[in-house]
């Protein structure tokens, strides 16, 4: 399997929320054997690999942000620290998982990175991960809601949504 | 505070039985998965055992498989190991530790001796 | 299962010397691969993931590198609580194993 990542950059707006977004693609095994963890972080653009340093979001851990369950179940984070810290992870029946950050700040701007972990049972694990760049902006070169650039090309997609809401 | 306190351990004669307990604080214990690990006396470390959040799947070294148990209550944050048909080379200190998905053992107690001798 | 070979056995240095240890895949673990410190009569703590990366308050002075089956422990300049054993552990494969361990000693 693989995570595809929508869109490779967001830009938004000071106080807007966001909705970054993973996808599991390929085959997926749904079979009792197979149980899928999925989290997400922040982290640097690395000289070997993306993604490997994990760093928190907003003071959460990618521990704190974690989903795990089967295949193409559906999954929420419950955790009031998450949601005291203005984030959600979430993931549907199709592979799609994310990460809302509400009220967002200079301070959000950075990398991202989903991580998902595939566990056979009795054999190896196996681990895959997408990174996408979130730009906050302020001022009056800021846009007026979220602005999505395709990870395939370089069309850029404009989020209508309004300051405090929630959007994908 | 975030820790891990093993329990349980003492001397035992070959072929006997003990069960280590592992109290956990400090975290949700329900969101790790959890491994015991061990160490005998003046050696490396040896991975024994290894359970999901949930309870299932369960993993063991094929050193212990069949002889000891893992199992946890996530109500009561507490891991346990039952061990059975001890042997002399079972005798190390039991180290239960955190864990999870694609991560390594970034919180670990402080150990409990389980001699096995007659 | 994966044999790791940790060299050398022992190593002997004094307080403000550069460290180097070494860990040996007997196959890649691409990437997955921790090193721990342990200190007498303590529990193993978690120094570097993923072959490069430092946990949560390690010190500047470790670094990891390496993937495959060669990786490298770095201390740059012993500390005195850096006298300890220190133990690489992959997480590619089941089982998960460790290293023999390298103990760092005061010369």
């Known amino acids: 399997f693989k995570v595809a990542t929508p869109y490779s950059l967001y830009v938004c707006p000071e106080g807007q929320n966001v909705t970054l977004t993973c996808r599991l693609l390929g085959p997926v095994d749904k079979g009792h054997d197979v149980t899928f963890y999925k989290t997400w972080y922040r982290s640097s653009r690395g000289e070997v690999q993306t993604c490997s340093e994990r760093r928190p979001i907003r003071n959460l851990t990618f521990q704190d942000l974690h989903l795990h369950h089967g295949g193409h179940q559906a999954a929420n984070t419950s955790h009031d620290l998450a949601q005291r810290h203005g984030l959600e992870s979430a993931s549907d029946h199709h592979g799609n998982f994310s990460i809302t950050m509400r009220n967002l700040t200079l301070l959000d701007s950075g990398l991202y990175c989903c991580l998902v972990v595939e566990i056979r049972h009795h054999h190896s694990e196996h681990r895959v991960h997408g990174a996408m760049e979130l730009q906050v902006q302020t001022g009056k070169d800021a846009p007026s809601n979220c602005v999505v650039y395709p990870s395939s090309s370089q069309e850029s997609e404009n989020i209508t949504a309004h300051h405090h809401h929630h959007h994908h | 505070q975030v820790q891990l306190v093993e329990s349980g351990g003492g001397l035992v004669k070959p072929g006997g039985s003990l069960r280590l307990s592992c109290a956990a604080s400090?975290?949700?214990?329900?969101?790790?998965?959890m491994s015991w690990i061990r160490q005998a006396p003046g050696k490396g470390l040896e991975w024994v055992s290894y359970i999901s959040n949930s309870g299932s799947p369960i993993y063991y070294a094929d050193s212990v498989k069949g002889r000891f148990t893992i199992s946890r209550d996530n109500a009561k944050n507490s891991l346990y190991l039952q061990m059975n048909s001890l042997r002399a080379e079972d005798t190390a200190v039991y180290y239960c530790?955190?864990?999870?998905?694609?991560?390594?053992?970034?919180?670990w107690g402080r150990g409990t001796l389980v001699t096995v001798s007659s | 299962e994966i044999v790791l070979t940790q060299s050398p056995a022992t190593l002997s240095l004094s307080p403000g010397e550069r460290a180097t240890l070494s860990c040996r895949a007997s196959q890649s673990v691409s990437s997955y691969l921790a090193w721990y410190q342990q200190k007498p009569g303590q529990a193993p703590r978690l120094l570097i993931y993923d072959a490069s990366n430092r946990a949560t308050g390690i010190p500047a002075r470790f670094s990891g590198s390496g993937s495959g089956t060669d990786f490298t422990l770095t201390i740059s300049s012993l500390e005195p609580e850096d006298f300890a054993v220190y133990y690489c552990?992959?997480?590619?494969?089941?089982?998960?194993?460790f290293g023999q361990g390298t103990k760092v000693e005061i010369k």
């Open positions: 530790a955190r864990d999870l998905p694609g991560w390594y053992f970034d919180l």
């Open positions: 400090g975290f949700t214990f329900s969101d790790y998965y």
């Open positions: 552990q992959q997480r590619n494969n089941w089982p998960y194993t």
